[in-house]
């Protein structure tokens, strides 16, 4: 019970009426830190009516007829105060002699009970009809989350009684649970921004500023949405929420405007072979869009070339790409555009990378293989084979030659200097096949092998031999 | 208890500039606005515009835009008032007016005593 | 702008007798919240001015409650049941539903 009032720093002699008996022994039983010195509190109204309550126990057995109905005293009923404020208030029952059993007084606040170090504080007034018991309860600085309903609870006779509600309302500025968001927005498309506050007090009234202007001269009840039909530029906006106790500001968001990024910066090589560069890149700025893909675009720098573009396409990130199917010993001009959903960034500033020289496009040509009897040697002629500039400088050969007979295969290579196109390679097996290939090697690395050349190594004299660079499936000719 | 505490008369020529302070105690400045409001002999009050303490973002009636200026110093919880190019018609008396939007509209609750300012060659 | 029209420009009352103001709108005062955001402003000889009434009757708290406020639309009135030496002064009406916020041209109050 109680009526609604609006009550703050209320003192304890506040709280009670009627008249005040004179002072009685007091048993001060503190359930945590007593909030007031004093050691003597004025007890409740001690007249013994005892109201009639909905809280009071139903009494069945024959002797608890007799007793009369204990009910908590009515005390205020809603408290209304602001934020920081102190407050006190408090519970109380006379419980006749009658009555043999009784436990302490809790209390509870939205029906949980509140345990722990809460100011509260616990009195007893004895006197020949019974005993008054007063439960205060205080809070120093309220805060918002000390809202709720507190009741005191109490046993007697084995029997739970609860008293009214006291309702505690802490009112302060508005407090902001939903603040615009920063966005990136597409230039003259519309988009909302949200604010949301809450009191108490409500209601809680927004105002909504863009670059420090108001947009609304009339406020919207919270939670407001402003729509904003389109930016040309970046703009800065807030709210203001507004309530009885006053105004709170949001933070301020910046609204941007998305734009083309800006181009990559530092385009280095990392690394190139004869046919690929290794490219990485900086992404610029992204404009306020995250970046799609990037275009790699490369030209032939050489003055003969015709000028045109390839462009090679990739993600975003890694800020990496490997072009491939790049001429050998080459030079190109590399630069690097990047994309967001409003389009294309300008191309970096373009930078030169050349290849290295390639390995031999072609075989040596017209291998013709020999058996020196004799010397128990193979007598390997070719002519050297037309390498284009890019190609590289030869260094070399690499001859390759199996050996196979009945029950044993042996794979061996060697390799021989520019100087001259001939070779002489030791038998291994007689009464076998050897098949010969042979590859051009520069700095730029080995060539295909030519075409197998087959000879057939006799137990003694008779030979087979294959002397041209197509492959020999049988004996072709004989010496 | 909230005060709102203003400068004292001025008295300047036409094309000067005057500055008016409103100087609040008792409440924490920067929840609230404060409104100025004009009162020239024989005319109705007016209302110039409001500043919001916390943010300064300021709104200005029509007929206050241009030579007018409400700014703030926080840490002295005081609100300004500026004029410039002061002209005869600027005489008058400028009350400033604790101001927010609650329930019942902007409150308009506390006002400064005034400050008479005097235009005259 | 609203323009806010108050009669009688003078009003001479005995201590002890009513009175009555009247402050007319150009343009309705309710809002599209179902609120009436019209207000009561009294000056004392020599003081600031402090604020009386808001949406239309609600007493600011310390106000006597011989003041009454009514009215809706355009058309309002502020009547003092009994007035007393305290009362006197010039009262203003002010709208705050339209920006921008305008007054009354004041109704001076003198005792006789």
């Known amino acids: 019970g109680g009526t609604a009032e609006k009550w703050e720093e209320t003192e304890l002699d506040q709280l009670f009426s009627g008249p005040l008996p004179g002072r009685l022994p007091v048993n001060h039983r503190p359930f945590s830190a007593p909030h007031s010195s004093r050691d003597q509190l004025p007890p409740p109204q001690t007249g013994r009516s005892h109201p009639a309550h909905t809280a009071a126990p139903q009494v069945t057995s024959t002797a608890s007829k007799l007793l009369p109905p204990v009910a908590f005293n009515h005390t205020i009923g809603h408290i209304v105060l602001s934020e920081h404020k102190n407050v006190k208030f408090n519970c109380s029952i006379n419980i006749p002699n009658t009555y043999q059993e009784t436990a302490g007084i809790s209390w509870w606040k939205d029906g949980k009970e509140l345990l722990g170090a809460h100011h509260s504080i616990t009195q007893f007034y004895p006197d020949e009809e019974g005993v008054s018991i007063i439960a205060l309860f205080s809070i120093a600085s309220v805060q918002r989350s000390d809202n709720g309903s507190y009741f005191c609870k109490m046993k007697v006779n084995n029997r739970e009684i609860v008293s009214d509600p006291i309702y505690v309302e802490v009112q302060g500025l508005p407090y902001f649970i939903k603040q615009p968001e920063s966005v990136n927005v597409t230039r003259n498309t519309a988009f909302n921004l949200t604010c949301q506050a809450v009191g108490p007090p409500e209601p809680v009234n927004i105002f909504w500023v863009q670059n420090s202007s108001r947009v609304n001269e009339k406020p919207e009840r919270s939670p407001s949405v402003l729509t904003v039909p389109g930016l040309t530029e970046t703009a800065v906006f807030s709210c203001e929420a507004h309530n009885d106790k006053g105004l709170t500001v949001s933070k301020g968001v910046h609204i941007n405007i998305k734009v083309i990024p800006s181009p990559p910066t530092e385009v280095h090589i990392l690394n190139s072979t004869a046919h690929s560069i290794l490219v990485s890149w900086v992404p610029g700025f992204d404009g306020y869009s995250p970046l799609q893909n990037c275009s790699i675009q490369v030209k032939e720098a050489d003055r003969l070339s015709n000028g045109s573009v390839m462009v090679f396409n990739t993600s975003a990130s890694p800020h990496l790409y490997e072009i491939q199917q790049l001429q050998a010993l080459a030079n190109y001009s590399i630069a690097v555009s990047c994309r967001n959903e409003i389009g294309w960034s300008a191309v970096s500033p373009w930078i030169l990378a050349s290849t290295t020289e390639g390995a031999p496009s072609v075989a040596p040509l017209n291998i013709t293989v020999f058996l020196n009897e004799s010397n128990n040697i193979l007598d390997i002629r070719w002519t050297k084979p037309p390498i284009k500039r890019q190609d590289g400088e030869l260094v070399g050969y690499r001859i390759s030659h199996v050996w196979e007979s009945a029950g044993t295969y042996k794979e061996l290579s060697e390799e021989v200097s520019q100087n001259g196109s001939w070779a002489q390679i030791p038998v291994q097996i007689h009464n076998a096949t050897c098949t010969v290939r042979i590859a051009a090697i520069t700095k730029g690395g080995i060539g295909p092998f030519s075409e197998p050349v087959n000879i057939i190594i006799p137990e003694h004299s008779k030979v087979d031999y294959a002397p041209s660079s197509t492959p020999a499936p049988g004996n072709t000719d004989s010496m | 208890q909230i005060q709102l505490v203003q400068s004292g008369p001025e008295l300047k020529k036409p094309g000067e500039t005057v500055k008016i302070s409103c100087k609040a105690s008792g409440n924490t400045f920067t929840t609230y606005g404060m409104s100025w409001v004009k009162q020239a002999p024989g005319k109705n009050l007016k209302w110039m515009g409001w500043i919001n303490n916390y943010s300064g973002v300021s709104t200005y009636a029509d007929d206050f835009k241009g030579r007018f200026a409400f700014s703030l110093e926080t840490s002295a919880t005081t609100a300004y008032l500026q004029i410039n190019n002061l002209t005869n018609e600027d005489s008058a008396t400028y009350f400033c007016?604790?101001?927010?939007?609650?329930?019942?509209?902007?409150?308009?609750?506390?006002w400064g005593q005034g400050t008479t300012l005097t235009v005259s060659s | 702008d609203v323009v806010m029209t108050q009669t009688p420009l003078t009003l001479s009352v005995t201590i002890g007798q009513p009175a009555s103001i009247s402050c007319k709108s150009s343009q309705s005062l309710l809002d599209s919240d179902g609120k009436t955001y019209l207000n009561w402003l009294l000056q004392r000889p020599g003081q600031s001015p402090k604020r009386l009434m808001y949406?239309?009757?609600k007493l600011d708290s310390g106000v006597p409650d011989r003041f009454t406020g009514s009215g809706s639309g355009t058309d309002f009135t502020l009547k003092i049941s009994r007035v007393e030496a305290e009362d006197l002064g010039v009262y203003y009406c002010w709208q705050g539903t339209h920006f921008p916020r305008t007054f009354g041209g004041g109704t001076k109050l003198e005792i006789k």
């Open positions: 949406l239309v009757s």
């Open positions: 007016a604790r101001d927010y939007y609650g329930s019942g509209g902007w409150v308009f609750d506390y």
